[in-house]
């Protein structure tokens, strides 16, 4: 073994933060792969690993592609799979994974299933059905076009199956409440019998969830078929089309016919002979667990090993079972000793307390896999017969919803505001006091001044303006601000006081007592609008329902933030809505959550983090 410049962590309770995710695996599987990868080292050395939810973690885990913010760009598929930095502050100790790889458990793409009789178990590839081998979901044996797979190696023997993610089962995001696509559907007078990207510039495939989009305006996004998304060839990123014709013969799954190298491929139209469009089918992928265990070895201070059987050897090979070799164990014990594990109490970091139960994990992307009320039967052809017509509840809302890409520009609400010198640059502000969308512009408040950010070309940034000039009664330091989308009243909070502005008229300051908040609530960190004059009010890891008209909280409604918004910092100091997304700020960073405040969603449905970024670079678009 070799160590890295003698560098190691000076403490044994290591914290880690999963900053973002790959689309290749369900989030709970990614969480689990990382937890198991850390546990490998914790088994043989006196180390504990605690997941936290902020950038102060020792080891920040990130998926990225090509140039991803450090000096070591990734190189596309294969080759360099991931990299890690040795222990230390900042980027040191972090582990980055190349998201141009196919991340799996080492045995092919992981496809969760729905309904069927396997309780959500992932597909098993390859599987045998009627004596043939399948390496992707198939519609064979069905007449409704719904793709399915076996969840064991042999469907003929075991009869275990589930339905693959498909627009025929459900859609994601949009406003169609997760209902399946309706085919054909009408869009701009034309009929569509498959998902389309028409009308969108971002490439997302969508469909109508009623027969007529023009009339009903209801839609959803089509689930990605990762089992059938090709790489290479001349159609990278397109979906396999099954069945397809090659040399006059029909194929219902990927094939190696016509190739000497044995690689599986498919056509991306129904007829290869005429269209010549094709790509390689997804391969076995790389085990996220094994690669992570190797990278975490680096992040703990181990350099590469010259022992080919060691986990720290610099070449990837898939293996099952406990991955450490004696050389790996000797190395980690040289750095951290052999002693028993330390007391597994979480470190006193600001983002892990107080969480009386286990810290929240990101909402898994697998919707509930409840059995349908009528269990499907096996049809005469041996394939599973259609499942229920009702779809599973919609998945987390993470994709962009359509609508204007920029908010309406704000009118000039500043009464003779005066600008500071250009040197007062908001890009130099580490942490803003409050951020809020007011009159369509994002307002950034700091120390009695504010800037307005209009998301359009030209000069999007205005200010700084004196806060007290525009809203005369306000103190210099604010905790949060919020504009009621219905009445356009603006709420400001500072300490235990609230001010409400209607234009220039102010009501307040009012004590938080008047809102029904007890003395333990020392500040309000933000509000998010809900339908029909309601909002969510946040403070110190808790959230209440708040009536904007009566300006009272419902004391019975209080819950922990992570029950409703999984994966955001419990102690976010500023929470606001912008362009129909909720933002939770902690330090220089924000966690963005997609949620639909107009749609009647089930109370306490866990909303999904879909982005993490810098307030200055990503929201203010600082250079």
């Amino acid at each position: 073994f070799q160590t890295f410049k003698g560098l190691k962590w000076d403490h044994h309770n290591i914290t880690y933060w999963i900053q973002n995710y790959s689309e290749d695996l369900p989030r709970d599987m990614i969480d689990d792969a990382f937890a198991r990868a850390f546990a490998v080292w914790g088994e043989v050395a006196p180390l504990t690993f605690t997941r936290v939810y902020g950038p102060e973690a020792d080891i920040v885990i990130q998926f990225g592609v090509a140039e991803h913010g450090d000096g070591y760009p990734f190189d596309g598929k294969d080759g360099l799979l991931a990299h890690a930095f040795p222990p230390g502050a900042g980027v040191q100790g972090d582990a980055h994974f190349d998201d141009d790889e196919l991340w799996s458990l080492g045995k092919g793409v992981v496809i969760p299933t729905y309904y069927g009789n396997s309780n959500g178990a992932p597909c098993h590839f390859p599987f045998t059905f009627e004596g043939r081998s399948y390496s992707a979901c198939t519609t064979d044996g069905r007449n409704d076009g719904t793709p399915w797979c076996s969840t064991t190696a042999d469907y003929d023997k075991d009869g275990k199956f589930g339905f693959c993610p498909s627009e025929r089962l459900y859609t994601e995001h949009g406003n169609g409440e997760g209902k399946p696509c309706v085919f054909p559907f009408i869009f701009e007078g034309r009929s569509y019998s498959a998902c389309t990207t028409k009308g969108r510039s971002d490439g997302y495939r969508w469909c109508a969830t009623t027969a007529n989009y023009d009339q009903d305006k209801l839609y959803g996004f089509c689930p990605t078929r990762v089992d059938a998304t090709v790489v290479g060839g001349n159609s990278a990123g397109e979906l396999c089309v099954f069945p397809f014709v090659f040399l006059g013969k029909q194929y219902s799954s990927c094939t190696s016919d016509g190739r000497r190298d044995g690689r599986l491929w498919c056509a991306t139209t129904s007829n290869f002979d005429t269209d010549k469009k094709w790509g390689f089918c997804p391969d076995q992928g790389y085990s996220l667990f094994l690669v992570a265990a190797h990278e975490f070895g680096h992040a703990l201070g181990l350099d590469h090993s010259s022992v080919p059987e060691a986990l720290m050897y610099p070449l990837y090979s898939y293996l099952e079972g406990f991955p450490l070799n004696k050389d790996d164990i000797d190395g980690i014990q040289y750095l951290y000793g052999r002693g028993s594990k330390p007391d597994p109490r979480p470190p006193a970091t600001t983002t892990t307390e107080p969480q009386p139960t286990a810290p929240p994990t990101m909402c898994p992307t697998i919707p509930p896999t409840a059995y349908p009320t009528v269990g499907p039967t096996v049809g005469p052809t041996g394939a599973p017969s259609p499942g229920p017509t009702s779809s599973p509840s919609p998945g987390p809302t993470g994709a962009p919803s359509p609508g204007p890409t920029a908010p309406p520009t704000a009118g000039s609400s500043e009464a003779s505001t005066e600008s500071l010198s250009p040197a007062d640059n908001p890009c130099n502000v580490d942490v803003f006091d409050a951020i809020a969308e007011i009159q369509g512009a994002l307002h950034f408040f700091k120390d009695g001044w504010y800037w307005k950010f209009l998301n359009h070309r030209g000069s999007p940034l205005q200010g700084p303006f004196l806060t007290a000039r525009t809203w005369p009664a306000l103190p210099a330091t604010l905790d949060s601000a919020f504009e009621d989308p219905q009445t356009k009243r603006v709420f400001f909070f500072s300490g235990r006081q609230m001010w409400v502005y209607t234009g220039k008229t102010v009501l307040g300051p009012r004590s938080l007592d008047k809102l029904g908040l007890g003395p333990e609530v020392t500040h309000v960190s933000g509000l998010l609008p809900r339908r029909l004059g309601k909002a969510l009010l946040f403070s110190k890891g808790r959230v209440w329902r708040f009536d904007l008209k009566s300006q009272k909280v419902d004391p019975q409604s209080v819950i922990r933030v992570d029950k409703e918004f999984s994966g955001v910092p419990w102690n976010s100091h500023d929470i606001f809505q912008y362009q129909d997304k909720a933002y939770f700020c902690h330090g220089k960073f924000f966690w963005r959550v997609s949620f639909q405040n107009e749609v009647n969603k089930v109370d306490h449905e866990v909303n999904q983090v879909d982005d993490v970024g810098y307030v200055t670079y990503d929201l203010l678009q600082c250079p």
Epitope: F4, K5, L7, E67, G69, D70, G71, Y72, P73, D75, G76, D78, G79, L80, L81, A82, H83, A84, F85, P86, G88, G90, V91, Q92, H294, E295, H298, D303, H304, P314
Partner: antibody, heavy 124, light 107 residues
């Protein structure tokens, strides 16, 4: 002992081509990222291109993108730079350099071994 | 891209004196900075990697310090063979960049 030996430089007319080679010895060549760095007469250092140990996708400075191609033959322990459509401003001493980092452990920063350089002169 | 500014452009000192060379980055690069020495007609030689670690075979009179945006190369007591051009190079962000160099000459 680590050694890097460049060859292939010379005088070429604008629009012409040259292929530089760098023979490596004394280390496990296939494990390390390799770089070309150039230095115009009397000027500072400028990175030209890098190829990762995997030999996969490569990276180029904007000034040479589309004209230069870096490659490596790990079985021969040799790094190459194919230079096409040469311009007068490409005149420089070209060095091959070994990255101190290798593979996925990226704490190192620095080029710990350099070749002696080969002069490329582009002139009519 | 990150710009590295070295100062002074030229430093005139006598053997035995202490030399302090500066390299400033246009944005934070953590500790991803290296220092090289180049003598006329020779290839650059790595002195310091990761801001403060001496490369193999480099005498102890050379030391590096700094983190973020401000970095310093110090030669505690100049020897005649130390008079050369010194370059800093960053890899805190892509693409890598070099400073314009500081010429250390005999006074």
């Amino acid at each position: 002992e680590v050694q890097l030996l460049e060859s292939g430089g010379g005088l070429v007319q604008p629009g012409g081509s040259l292929r530089l080679s760098c023979a490596a010895s004394g280390f496990t060549f296939s494990w390390y990222d390799m770089w070309w760095v150039r230095q115009a007469p009397g000027k500072g250092l400028e990175w030209v291109s890098v190829i990762y140990s995997s030999g996969g996708p490569t990276f180029y400075a904007d000034s040479v993108k589309g004209r230069f191609t870096i490659s490596r033959d790990n079985s021969k322990n040799t790094l190459y730079l194919q230079m096409n459509s040469l311009r007068a401003e490409d005149t420089a001493v070209y060095y091959c350099a070994k990255d101190r980092a290798y593979g996925d452990y990226v704490g190192w920063n620095g080029f710990d071994y350099w070749g002696q350089g080969t002069l490329v002169t582009v002139s009519s | 891209e990150i710009v590295l500014t070295q100062s002074p452009a030229t430093l005139s000192l006598s053997p035995g004196e202490r030399a302090t060379l500066s390299c400033r980055a246009s944005q934070s690069i953590s500790s991803f900075l290296a220092w090289y020495q180049q003598k006329p007609g020779q290839a650059p030689r790595l002195l310091i990697y990761d801001a403060s670690y001496r490369a193999t075979g480099i005498p102890a009179r050379f030391s590096g310090s700094g983190s973020g945006t401000d970095f310093t190369l110090t030669i505690s007591s100049l020897e005649p063979e130390d008079f050369a051009v010194y370059y800093c190079q960053q890899r805190g962000n892509w693409p890598i960049t070099f400073g314009q160099g500081t010429r250390l000459e005999i006074k």
